[in-house]
Interface confidence: low
Amino acid sequence: SDKLYQRKEPVISSVHTKVKGIAEVTENVTEGGVTKLGHSIFDTADYTFPLQGNSFFVMTNYVKSEGQVQTLCPEYPRRGAQCSSDRRCKKGWMDPQSKGIQTGRCVPYDKTRKTCEVSAWCPTEEEKEAPRPALLRSAENFTVLIKNNIHFPGHNYTTRNILPTMNGSCTFHKTWDPQCSIFRLGDIFQEAGENFTEVAVQGGIMGIEIYWDCNLDSWSHHCRPRYSFRRLDDKNTDESFVPGYNFRYAKYYKENNVEKRTLIKAFGIRFDILVFGTGGKF
């Protein structure tokens, strides 16, 4: 309740997160013309990426373009990219939608289609749908530890969400353990009324709100966080211009003294931790 006699001050906060969990990924791997099931293990270093600010990212799905080298090749025949003669291809032109610089030649992409040749990382990335179900759908069972230190400088008061008495094996529950700062990712989605399995395919942005409503008067002192969760991105993926949340990164390597890379389009959940609140004191 609002205490008008108190001097209020907004919270100053710092956040640190640690994600834990292992995922086993099974996907089709084509080698030597033979497609077989490949099994790989993903640990924290494979699926999380350091982000700036109060955010962390968990990869839930991906599309790989393996063995790319810098050379000349036909660009991917996306809509409007096909050509029938060199006239359609402009030397030195960099189409923002393309993956390279045009050489001015119209060349066969495959037996039926021709596209402009580009100087690029080849073969150019194909426009593939994100795998369904998501490859790292088991990320639902990952946990994140959120460390949140707060400070009210005007009141010379500092505290944090993790208390010395807290059990390191607890899991947050709105009713049974509302002060535990270890959250199961699937539970976060459930609390926000979202389906993790569905969002994991294209990715999304989830907000973790930490609200501090602190009464710093010694006779009725109370300063503990309240956690709530809501989805922040446009969930109507069919209607939104660029659905979900994804980015690309590359792993570089040398093979027979030729620099190559594997391009990975990573889909996943960006968790934004939003800390707000006030501290009041007479």
Epitope: E66, L72, P123
Partner: nanobody
């Protein structure tokens, strides 16, 4: 100097199988970043594309006439490409040539064009007859 050496040809009855091998050697040749292909030439006919396997991602390509019957594969550590030929027909009779396209020619996928390939083997004879 790059050398491609084919083996595995011979005489086989219709419906039978053969496995052709092609090994690549040579200091300047980067096998694992090359497109490898098989072509064939029947007496009095033009050189015909049979199958190819991409340098970068093991993608395979086949002529319509051999789809479902022939399988191309490669073994990088041994610098060898294979052509497994099943359900052979008399019209498959030809000299089979192994060809390689090194990355220095660019990554363009003209896999069914002989002009793409800059290295060729001497050929191995395949005869399908009863």
């Amino acid at each position: 100097e790059v050398q491609l050496v084919e083996s595995g040809g011979g005489l086989v009855q219709p419906g039978g199988s053969l496995r052709l091998s092609c090994s690549a050697s040579g200091r300047t040749f980067s096998f694992s970043t090359s497109t490898m292909g098989w072509f064939r030439q029947a007496p009095g006919k033009e050189l015909e594309f049979v199958a190819a396997i991409d340098w970068s991602d093991f993608n395979t390509y086949y002529a319509d006439s051999v789809k479902g019957r022939f399988t191309i594969s490669r073994h990088n550590p041994r610098n060898t490409v294979y052509l497994q030929m099943n359900s052979l027909r008399p019209e498959d009779t030809a000299v089979y040539y192994c060809a390689a396209h090194s990355e220095t020619r660019g990554g363009t996928r003209y896999f069914d064009r002989p002009s793409l390939y800059n290295y060729w083997g001497q050929g191995t004879q395949v005869t399908v007859s009863s």
